[in-house]
């Protein structure tokens, strides 16, 4: 029943990925001439939720006062105006972290590294895990997904780097996760911070993926190179 | 056919709490929101409050919230409606009804309603 | 909260008579109107939602109408099974309200 009405803008606060217990807020924002808005789940088969809109009317919140793992999902909302309903919001993926226990997150050789040189970061999980993601704090598009071919359980993920530059500099945490749901993360790792030293000058690895031309050293996504890692996980980008 | 099949009567005290079960059979129960109308004795329909079965996501009229709960168990299709520190002004039928969710949002299917008393 | 005020509040007509009733509500509904009926010691009926649509199994001399805040119900050629009160309910938003009830009598 979708019509020509524009869709609705979809966000979280404080965010989309949130630590089990926690709270947070789903937002739809629409127009001034809502009458209603509808959040819908995906695979939930009646509107996962409906409410009045806000004053003044161009948008609704909807309220999960504590973060389990039935509400990690994918959610979409629309809203109805006089002529008809919306069509539907961007995609919202809400992630939940403390589904599992906290892998750890080791730099091989060291985080001391020299530009140019070779890093290899190292995320391990006591459980066997498909999924190991890397996280580099204050980046723009921070997720790198290593996931395991044909559901193989592992232990551990590489995530190797070479050449090392300034730009791969900064904190790491890592989350392992099994792919029947990629919304259910285990504890964040204890923070790795990987020091790189020499010049910063060093060229800027180039992205496999194309990037908004404003974006600067922090806005790239993660770039480890070289030969995917000998564990049986593949590499994707997310 | 779809069926909504309530809990028999109750008689209550003033102050103390009901709870009211509304069986649903004939169509997938997650599937609808559940609405709770009462209706006291000769008066018209007063709408409680709804609950999204596959989540327990509610809404309340503000004048129940404080008092009413809404609760599903999905094992067995049913829907409850808690409603405490009664008063005689609550002396009503209670009525579940099932949610249509299209143009209109209707409420297609009803109970047979169950009453309650509040005497002291 | 969106007042329904229907009207008449009672009304007498004989078997065969066209009858319509009226709902009114204090802010525009946007068509999200429904209609249902009550028979002493049972639990209402749809009868029409969105206005005008017919639910499942409901006689086609039922018939609605309306927009914005005013809205009827019709009932063509009035059958005995047909006494009975009749309310309106809005859908529009949260909480959804009903008309106070149109007691339709046998003359």
């Known amino acids: 029943q979708a019509g020509p009405l524009p869709k609705p803008t979809l966000w979280a606060e404080p965010g989309s990925v949130i630590s089990w217990g926690n709270s947070v807020t789903i937002w739809c924002q629409g127009t001034l001439e809502a009458r209603e808005y509808r959040l819908d789940k995906e695979e939930s088969p009646a509107p996962w939720d409906r409410q009045n809109p806000l004053e003044p009317k161009n948008k609704a919140r909807f309220s999960i006062p504590s973060m389990t793992e039935d509400y990690a999902g994918r959610y979409r909302c629309y809203y109805r105006s006089p002529v008809g309903w919306s069509q539907p919001s961007d995609p919202l993926e809400l992630v939940m972290t403390g589904a599992y226990s906290k892998p750890t997150l080791s730099a091989l050789p060291s985080p001391l590294v020299t530009s140019g040189k070779s890093v290899t970061l190292l995320c391990q999980s006591r459980s066997p895990m498909d999924t190991f993601l890397l996280i580099k704090e204050r980046a723009a598009h921070p997720l790198l997904h290593l996931r395991s071919e044909h559901g193989a359980q592992q232990h551990q993920a590489e995530f190797p780097m070479s050449p090392v530059t300034s730009v791969h500099g900064g904190t790491y945490r890592c989350f392992s996760s099994h792919g029947f749901s990629h919304y259910l993360l285990s504890h964040p790792s204890d923070p790795l911070e990987l020091i790189v030293s020499g010049s910063l000058e060093d060229p800027r690895p180039s992205p496999t993926r194309s990037v908004s031309t404003a974006a600067g050293p922090e806005d790239q996504p993660l770039m480890p190179t070289g030969s995917v890692p000998h564990s049986g996980l593949r590499r994707h980008w997310e | 056919q779809v069926q909504l099949v309530q809990s028999g009567a109750e008689v209550k005290k003033p102050g103390a709490s009901v709870k009211v079960s509304c069986k649903a059979s004939?169509?997938?129960?997650?599937?609808?929101?559940m609405h709770w109308v009462r209706q006291a004795p000769g008066q018209g329909l007063e709408w409680i409050g709804e609950?999204?079965?596959?989540?327990?996501?509610?809404n309340y009229n503000e004048k129940f919230k404080s008092r009413a709960t809404l609760t599903v168990d999905k094992s067995t299709s049913t829907a409850y409606m808690e409603l405490s520190s009664l008063r005689s002004e609550d002396t009503a039928v209670y009525y579940c009804?099932?949610?249509?969710?299209?143009?209109?949002?209707?409420?297609?299917?009803w109970g047979q309603g169950t009453t309650v008393t509040v005497s002291s | 909260d969106i007042q329904m005020t229907q009207s008449p509040s009672s009304l007498s007509a004989s078997v065969g008579d066209r009858v319509t009733i009226t709902c009114r509500a204090s802010?525009?509904?946007?068509?999200?109107l429904n209609w249902y009926q009550q028979k002493p010691g049972k639990a209402p009926k749809l009868l029409i939602y969105?206005?005008?649509r017919l639910h499942s199994g409901v006689p086609s001399r039922f018939s609605g109408s309306g927009s914005g805040t005013e809205y009827t119900l019709t009932i063509s050629s009035l059958q005995p099974d047909d006494f009975a009160t009749y309310y309106c309910?809005?859908?529009?938003?949260?909480?959804?309200?009903f008309g106070q009830g149109t007691r339709l009598e046998i003359k």
């Open positions: 009804a099932r949610d249509r969710y299209d143009e209109g949002n209707a409420m297609d299917y």
């Open positions: 969105y206005t005008s």
């Open positions: 802010q525009d509904i946007t068509n999200y």
């Open positions: 004939g169509y997938t129960f997650t599937s609808y929101w």
């Open positions: 309910q809005q859908g529009d938003t949260l909480p959804r309200t």
């Open positions: 609950i999204n079965p596959s989540n327990g996501r509610t």
